[in-house]
């Protein structure tokens, strides 16, 4: 049994890091493999992650972490029984994938304005809380070409757009994702999408 693609990990910079790797053949990850991880820190304890299958030869493990900070560095050991298959390390702050924003809501009761709001996925005491920026994707269910991205570079998790920038009388969907420049993160996953019917009064023409 050998590792074909070494584990690569990303951290949500809060409580979970996800590591993925591929074996050289079909593997029952949860029964045959264990990923041991330990913070390189005084008094730290070793933890064991039981991987799950991710395709025939792929495995994925969700590592639980407390109080993640930029100085943290973890040792990783991948075991198959008594055999050490791979040894590496992982610094969560250098491989951050933020959590996806939640609770995306479209408020259509403001005159001729659409207000989109969502929730910041981090608590106020997490460093990323004040450093996320967002991308909002709005698209038409009827017209695949009607697809747009709004970059939200301010901290408030909201976006106002004129309803008239979208077509009236049809349904739209929106979703939002986040990233943080400070840690050069990747984009988060998209939030679940929300749907609304866009309607507004056309301006009266003489």
């Amino acid at each position: 049994m050998k590792v074909l693609q070494e584990p690569t990990c990303v951290s949500d910079y809060m409580s979970i890091s996800t590591c993925e790797w591929k074996m050289n053949g079909p593997t029952n990850c949860s029964t045959e493999l264990r990923l041991l991880y330990q913070l390189v820190f005084l008094l730290s304890e070793a933890h064991t992650c039981i991987p799950e299958n991710n395709g025939g030869a792929g495995c994925v493990c969700h590592l639980l972490m407390d109080d993640v900070v930029s100085a943290d560095n973890y040792t990783l050991d991948l075991w198959a029984g008594q055999q050490l298959l791979w040894k590496g390390s992982f610094k969560p702050s250098e491989h951050v994938k933020p959590r996806a924003p939640g609770n995306l809501t479209v408020h259509t009761n403001v005159s001729d304005t659409l207000l989109l709001t969502w929730s910041n996925p981090y608590p106020p005491d997490n460093y990323l809380y004040n450093h996320l920026t967002y991308a909002v994707n709005i698209w038409s269910e009827n017209d695949p070409a009607d697809f747009r991205i709004y970059n939200v570079t301010y901290l408030e998790p909201s976006l106002r757009i004129a309803a008239s920038t979208l077509k009236s009388g049809i349904s739209y969907r929106a979703r939002v994702r986040a990233w943080a420049q400070c840690y050069n993160t990747t984009w988060s996953e998209w939030s679940p999408s929300t749907k609304w019917h866009n309607s507004y009064r056309e301006p009266f023409e003489q």
Epitope: L42, L43, D66, S70
Partner: antibody, heavy 116, light 111 residues
Framework: QVQLVQSGAEVKKPGASVKVSCKAS????????MHWARQAPGQGLEWMGI????????SYAQKFQGRVTMTRDTSTSTVYMELSSLRSEDTAVYYC?????????WGKGTLVTVSS | QSVLTQPPSVSAAPGQKVTISCSGG????????VSWYQQLPGTAPKLLIY???KRPSGIPDRFSGSKSGTSATLAITGLQTGDEADYYC????????????FGTGTKLTVL
Amino acid sequence: QVQLVQSGAEVKKPGASVKVSCKASGYAFTSYYMHWARQAPGQGLEWMGIINPSGGSASYAQKFQGRVTMTRDTSTSTVYMELSSLRSEDTAVYYCARGKYWMYDWGKGTLVTVSS
Amino acid sequence: QSVLTQPPSVSAAPGQKVTISCSGGSSNIGNSYVSWYQQLPGTAPKLLIYDNNKRPSGIPDRFSGSKSGTSATLAITGLQTGDEADYYCGTWDSSTVWEWPFGTGTKLTVL
């Protein structure tokens, strides 16, 4: 919000021991290390040691080795710092502080006076 | 005695800028991150800066930190009378046994 509530002031005689408590609330107690530091009157801060509330293991500054013991009670989310063989120069305010590489939150401090 | 050296005192007028230095060595500041703590008279220390230059939520951006080599600096702009306090740098040293030294402390007086 995070709160670290420390026990009240103590007056001790030289040679005696003192045990200071620090009750934590507002966060997952076993997820954060706890430091202890002290400050003698008019002096600076001095680090004493650190405890991992998850497993209960502790490590102490070399200066205090053999005289200090840090423990925890997960059922009450409380950490303790016991200092023995007290001498007059141990008169200080003792602080618990939550954190790993740095101290996010501090208790208000416990004044320990050592006097004959 | 502390292995991190700070000036005993600094002073400046309201609205001015002041800097406080913290000098260490290769086994502590040179190999770790620096934090800064503010201690108002009669109160417990409070975290002001961590990770060399990050501010906890609620700390105004008048406070900033930087690190270069084995030294670190705390800068305070737009000084206010309420900033009058003792300031301590801190770091950790894992070269032999792990220890968390604090700086000698600096008394800031707002004139």
